[in-house]
Interface confidence: low
């Protein structure tokens, strides 16, 4: 059942987030989600991960780009893109990172 | 209306230690990157670190990695740059810059940066 809580050994993360108590987190893996909400700029959470697993699979789109990771603050330093929207004929440009 | 002020450049030795301050004014929330930057005439401006709305990320350029060190107090709307063992290359107008409010990503392209300060002086002689 996705729904239920990983009962694995836990992980420390980093957590950076509005919902944060501290720097880091213990869960059963660590998450960076990077969500663009309509007419905003991208947003990019830290934090940890105990339920739906399902989502670390998800296929980045334009809006959203989950990522999931099991190994001690491996959220730390991963930058995410979200899914290009441009004709196929363009090539997406590099920005600086 | 937002505005970064900087203070903290003069002149100084080589192998000597400075430390930027950039208060900001303007600003709702602290969800904001913040980051340093750097000028010389004639050249574009370069990356110098960067921190995240937490403070719990930074990042840094390879020139002044493990010698310049960047903080940020939330609290004071503040944001610091520790620059050690000074160099004559570092000599640079300091720019301290800010991204729009809900950016959340460390960037070294100074077009992600929203707001920007009127810079201060660095001289580092030999």
């Known amino acids: 059942d996705p729904v239920k809580p990983s009962r694995g050994p836990l992980v420390t993360c980093t957590c950076e987030s509005p919902h944060c108590k501290g720097p880091t987190c213990r869960g059963a893996w660590c998450t960076v989600v990077l969500v663009r909400e309509e007419g905003r700029h991208p947003q990019e959470h830290r934090g940890c991960g105990n339920l739906h697993r399902e989502l670390c699979r998800g296929r980045p789109t334009e809006f959203v780009n989950h990522y999931c990771c099991d190994s001690h603050l491996c959220n730390h330093n991963v930058s995410l893109v979200l899914e290009a929207t441009q004709p196929p004929s363009e090539q997406p440009g590099t920005d600086g990172q | 209306q937002v505005q970064l002020v900087e203070s903290g450049g003069g002149l100084v030795q080589a192998g000597g230690s400075l430390r930027l301050s950039c208060a900001a004014s303007?600003?709702?929330?602290?969800?904001?990157?913040m980051a340093w930057f750097r000028q010389i005439p004639g050249k574009e401006r370069e990356f110098v670190s960067g921190?995240?709305?937490?403070?719990?990320?930074?990042d840094y350029a390879d020139s002044v990695k493990g010698r310049f060190t960047i903080s940020r107090d939330n609290a004071k709307r503040a944001v610091y740059l520790q620059m050690n063992s000074l160099k004559p290359e570092d000599t640079a107008v300091y720019y301290c810059a800010s991204s729009a409010p809900g950016w959340d990503m460390l960037r070294r392209n100074s077009r992600d940066y929203s707001y920007w300060g009127q810079g201060t002086l660095v001289t580092v002689s030999s």
């Open positions: 921190i995240s709305w937490s403070g719990n990320r930074a």
């Open positions: 303007g600003l709702t929330g602290n969800y904001y990157v």
